[in-house]
C-alpha cells in the first residue's frame, strides 16, 4: 500500500477518507488505527458500529470519529481539534473475524495555525530519508509520500 498524506491545521478538524470496493468488503466493520513504530502493531483508535447495518452512525472515541458509507464504499474519519501529537501514521482497516485488511495507509501532518503566533517548533513533519517507497499525490489537503520520505520522526 502507498501512503496518502492528509494535512490539517492545529486546532481545526481534519477529515480523512478511505475509499474501498463496497462489494469486496460487504458486511465488514471498519476501523481506524495508529501505527506504533515502523514495524510495530496498529493500535485501534475507533471502529464502526458493532452492527454493520448501522455503520453510517458516527462513533466517537475522544476527538476521533468514524462513519462508513457502506454502499458508496467510503470510510470517513474526523480528527477534531487537531493537535501536534496527532501527527503520525495510521491505517483504515476492514475487519473480518480476527483479520484486519488494510484499506489505506494514512500519514497525518499537523500544520501550524497561521493565526497562532506561538512557537511551532513542536509541530512534526516527516524528515528526509533514503528508505521510504514511492507514492502518488492526492489532494483535499492530502498527498502521498514522496520517495525518500519516512512516516516517523527521527529518534534522537
Amino acid at each position: 500500500h502507498n501512503t496518502t498524506v492528509f494535512q490539517g491545521v492545529a486546532g481545526q478538524s481534519l477529515q480523512v477518507s478511505c475509499p474501498y470496493d463496497s462489494m469486496k468488503h460487504w458486511g465488514r466493520r471498519k476501523a481506524w488505527c495508529r501505527q506504533l513504530g515502523e514495524k510495530g502493531p496498529c493500535q485501534r483508535v475507533v471502529s464502526t458500529h458493532n452492527l454493520w447495518l448501522l455503520s453510517f452512525l458516527r462513533r466517537w472515541n475522544g476527538s476521533t470519529a468514524i462513519t462508513d458509507d457502506t454502499l458508496g464504499g467510503t470510510l470517513t474519519i474526523t480528527l477534531r481539534n487537531l493537535q501536534p501529537h496527532d501527527a503520525g501514521l495510521y491505517q483504515c482497516q476492514s475487519l473480518h473475524g480476527s483479520e484486519a485488511d488494510t484499506l489505506r495507509k494514512v500519514l497525518v501532518e499537523v500544520l501550524a495555525d497561521p493565526l497562532d503566533h506561538r512557537d511551532a517548533g513542536d509541530l512534526w513533519f516527516p524528515g528526509e530519508s533514503e528508505s521510504f517507497e514511492d507514492a502518488h499525490v492526492e489532494h483535499s489537503i492530502s498527498r502521498s509520500l514522496l520517495e525518500g520520505e519516512i512516516p516517523f520522526p527521527p529518534t534522537s
Epitope: D21, M23, K24, H25, W26, G27, R28, L51, W52, L53, H96, G97, S98, E99
Partner: antibody
Amino acid sequence: EVQLVQSGAEVKKPGESLKISCKGSGHSFTNYWIAWVRQMPGKGLEWMGIIYPGDSDTRYSPSFQGQVTISADKSISTAYLQWSSLKASDTAVYFCARQRTFYYDSSGYFDYWGQGTLVTVSS
Amino acid sequence: DIQMTQSPSSVSASVGDRVTITCRASQGISNWLAWYQQKPGKAPKLLIYAASSLQVGVPLRFSGSGSGTDFTLTISSLQPEDFATYYCQQADSFPRNFGQGTKLEIK
C-alpha cells in the same frame, strides 16, 4: 439460479502443467470471493486459497503457497487453479466454492460449490 | 493457522437417533464457524453458518451451537438421507481450515 461449473477430469503425467477452471453464472461473479478446496482420495477437505475476481486479490493457505496459482478472468466469470509441475500427490478432486454474502454478514462460508474436477497424476 | 479437530471421527447410529458431533478450534474464533454435509461423489453442502444459523432450505432437525473454541452439530432425529460425512470449518481468519470430518454411518 447460481451455478459454478468446473472443467472436466484430467489425467496428467508428473512434471506436466495444468490449469482447471470454474465458471460462474446466475450471480455477479466479480463481487464474490471464490475459493478452491482439495479433497484427496478418501480424505477430508483442505482449503487451498481464495480470490476476489473484482481485483484479483488472492490469499493462499501456507500449505499451498508456491505450489499452485489461483487466478480469475472477471470478463468471462471464470476462476482458475493451475500447476506448473504436477506431482503424483496432486491427485485429488478439486472444488471451487463461492463465499456466501448476506446483507449484513461478511461471512467466510461457502454456499455454492462446483461439481468438482478430478485430477489424476500418474506416470 | 487455526486447527480444527472433530470428534468422533466416525459414529454409527440408527434412523430416529439423536446425534451430536463436536468441533474444537485451536484458538478462539467467536462464532465464525460453519458445518457442511458431504455425500460420496458430491460437493459439500452448507448446513449451518455463524455457529448456529441454519442455511436456507436445511431441515430444522439440524442445529448448531457453541462459541469460542467448542462447537456442536446436533441432528435431533436421524433420517436415512443424513448418513454422510460432516465437516466443520472456521471462518475467523485465513486459511479457513476444515476439520478432518466425521463419518455418520448406519448402525
